[in-house]
Interface confidence: low
Amino acid sequence: PPRGRILGGREAEAHARPYMASVQLNGAHLCGGVLVAEQWVLSAAHCLEDAADGKVQVLLGAHSLSQPEPSKRLYDVLRAVPHPDSQPDTIDHDLLLLQLSEKATLGPAVRPLPWQRVDRDVAPGTLCDVAGWGIVNHAGRRPDSLQHVLLPVLDRATCNRRTHHDGAITERLMCAESNRRDSCKGDSGGPLVCGGVLEGVVTSGSRVCGNRKKPGIYTRVASYAAWIDSVLA
């Protein structure tokens, strides 16, 4: 099943997020991803946990998953590089870099997103954009077109409350509010964009969605700048 969803959001403006990628398994949407270089897509490591025998591909330039669009193109994956410290049973280091079979054809609907290199927390309350093709309600309806939602960043102390994530949010993670508007498992790997810069990647744990006591958890890309640079080099 697809890992993730945008709850309480709305349809995104078509092709306004040219960095947005759909990581696909056997031709079906599995996870979100974000184009960070001409030949590299950043996603979440857990996305490929169940993909051992399947064909993984990356769809770029898409708004609709099903409709023909001039900018759409499906790329094979040459190499999948999960973070070496990622583990199936934790949310830590949940990053994956996918090397495309060739450099993406760039254009208005396909363009890498600058990512944050300065390792500093985003200010609480900052509105950030998260997008994805995950299910849009608790009944499991899957959207065909890209959805997005604006979410305020939540301070780590609140996110680590006993009632929230009980100390699990390390300095390499960040949270966003989840008051009925939320990202979730299936938007895993998708981008959290603050001020036009990639700040976080949706983690792919089995978190309840849309529950204000269980804020969304995002991997802070700035905390992994050295690793990203070493893989892309």
Partner: antibody
């Protein structure tokens, strides 16, 4: 449809205990904490505490520690609140609520009287 | 604990009139954790507004919410008969969660 079914009114004697059930349906019981709230006649609502149905973890309002005990039975998707050493001050309507109070039970009136 | 003070306690309003109910907090509350509920006699409370300004499902658009810090309000742009009820504010910004005493809205 999310439903929280609470039992009917209870008339109990001072010093006794009462256990109020709240049976949940229409959603995954373990997805949300169950909160309990007290409303005394003519008074504001008071939060008693909540329980995480996944692991039974509880957080209580200091005021109700020793008075209320929250438990759950996952197999029947039912949350319980036990009130002990009852006095006339405990006469009130008690509500269970979930989904961060998006959903409430209809309330159980507990009357403490000799 | 944070004390929420609602005013007025009772308000009589004519149909079509604009209504503003206020909720004042004894210390600052995060706007994300300020909620309003509607309660009618014999019924349980209903979530009405969440995160200060977001209307819950099924709530008419004539309702709105605003505020920040220690001062919050619920506004009805044009009072209707079905709006007669008690309205409670609620904060979950710090423990324990607390509720205001409510404002009872009556139809004149």
């Amino acid at each position: 449809e999310v439903l929280l079914q609470q039992s009917g009114p209870e008339l109990v004697k001072p010093g006794a205990s009462v256990k109020i059930p709240c049976k949940a349906s229409g959603y995954t019981f373990t997805d949300y904490d169950m909160d309990w709230v007290k409303q005394s006649h003519g008074k504001s609502l008071e939060w008693i505490g909540h329980i995480n149905p996944n692991n039974g973890g509880t957080i209580y309002n200091q005021k109700f520690k020793g008075k209320a005990t929250l438990t759950v039975d996952k197999s029947s998707s039912t949350a319980y609140m036990e009130l002990r050493s009852l006095t006339s001050e405990d006469t009130a309507v008690y509500y269970c609520g979930t989904g961060d109070f998006a959903y409430w039970g209809h309330g159980t009136l507990v009357t403490v009287s000799a | 604990q944070i004390v929420l003070t609602q005013s007025p306690a009772i308000m009589s309003v004519s149909p079509g009139e604009k209504v503003t109910l206020t909720c004042s907090a004894s210390s600052s509350v995060s706007s994300s954790y300020l909620y309003w509920y509607q309660k009618k006699p014999g019924s349980s409370p209903k979530l009405w507004i969440y995160s200060t300004s977001n209307l819950a499902s099924g709530v008419p658009a004539r309702f709105s919410g605003s505020g920040s810090g220690t001062s919050y309000s619920l506004t009805i742009s044009s009072m209707e008969a079905e709006d007669a009820a008690s309205y409670f504010c609620h904060q979950w910004s710090s423990y324990p969660p607390t509720f205001g005493a409510g404002t009872k809205l009556e139809l004149k």
